[in-house]
Amino acid sequence: DHHHHHHEQKLISEEDLRADPCAARPCAHGGRCYAHFSGLVCACAPGYMGARCEFPVHPDGASALPAAPPGLRPGDPQRYL
């Protein structure tokens, strides 16, 4: 059985998806899609997070121990690469 991703009335086969993981345009809210060796990465626009940038970021999540290293994080709000 093929997995099919429905987007804009278009069905995308598993083969197509593996050839171009960004074909289904999975990144929401203006996130940019980049091919990755194990699939794809959504680089989220500022204010969004999640594997597909589907979540709005809410404050206070950064309070953690130990502090995370700085730098761009896929699936998190960031400047476009």
């Epitope: 699939g39 999640g50 594997a51 589907e54 309070s63 998190d76």
Partner: antibody, heavy 124, light 107 residues
Framework: QVQLVQSGAEVKKPGASVKVSCKAS????????VHWVRQAPGQGLEWMVI????????SYAQKFLGRVTMTRDTSTNTVYMELKSLRSEDTAVYYC?????????????????WGQGTTVTVSS | DIQMTQSPSAMSASVGDRVTITCRAS??????LVWFQQKPGKAPKRLIY???SLYSGVPSRFSGSGSGTEFTLTISSLQPEDFATYYC?????????FGQGTKLEIK
């Protein structure tokens, strides 16, 4: 194997706070999102919050904004969910669940591995 | 928020029966639809992701189908261990939402 182990049951008074922990093992902790979902007695499942254990960013369901705080400790691979100003309707089983990989997805699984649940009882 | 409506909310069936549970989304959710099984006192257990893909270890009597806003979970031949409550989950958009559940009881 991939596992999420949660802290034990809690009994709290109205107005108090509760902090529930979820310790991950069997995978790279910072590579997957973690969700919290709750279930009141005899009721359905309710999504609460997601955290990126690597960056610490969070997103809350609207009804929990300001009352739930998520933290994580990357040295012990543990996520914490604190719920403040408890009321009787917060009596529920609280589950953590592993979400999507932060990087590298062909397909999306929603939530694939769940903790055993933590019962929180709010009673005066 | 996207509302997920499951039907029926409860049903009784016998071992060997074919059972279908439906989940309707209030708007299109692409293929971001997951099914879970939950037994009393236990955490939900994953069954199906991406509408129709079985997680490894899930018996082939379980299947999923649908697209857009209407989705179904089918159990082709009920086994005693299948009596449980079933939930759908949309993970297309924030906030994630579950169906209210379908309790499958022994007739």
């Amino acid at each position: 194997q991939v596992q999420l182990v949660q802290s034990g049951a809690e009994v709290k008074k109205p107005g108090a706070s509760v902090k529930v922990s979820c310790k991950a093992s069997g995978y790279t902790f910072t590579s997957y999102y973690v969700h919290w979902v709750r279930q009141a007695p005899g009721q359905g499942l309710e999504w609460m919050v997601i955290i990126n254990p690597g960056g610490g960013t969070t997103s809350y369901a609207q009804k929990f904004l300001g009352r739930v705080t998520m933290t994580r400790d990357t040295s012990t691979n543990t996520v914490y969910m604190e719920l403040k100003s408890l009321r009787s309707e917060d009596t529920a089983v609280y589950y953590c669940a592993r979400g999507e990989a932060v990087t590298g997805n062909y397909f999306y699984y929603g939530m694939d591995v769940w903790g055993q649940g933590t019962t929180v009882t709010v009673s005066s | 928020d996207i509302q997920m409506t499951q039907s029926p909310s409860a049903m009784s069936a016998s071992v060997g029966d074919r059972v279908t549970i439906t989940c309707r989304a209030s708007q299109g959710i692409s293929n971001y639809l997951v099914w879970f099984q939950q037994k009393p006192g236990k955490a939900p257990k994953r069954l199906i992701y991406a509408v129709s893909s079985l997680y490894s270890g899930v018996p082939s009597r379980f299947s999923g189908s649908g697209s857009g806003t209407e989705f179904t979970l089918t159990i082709s031949s009920l086994q005693p261990e299948d009596f449980a409550t079933y939930y759908c989950l949309q993970h297309d958009s924030y906030p994630y939402t579950f169906g209210q559940g379908t309790k499958l009881e022994i007739k």
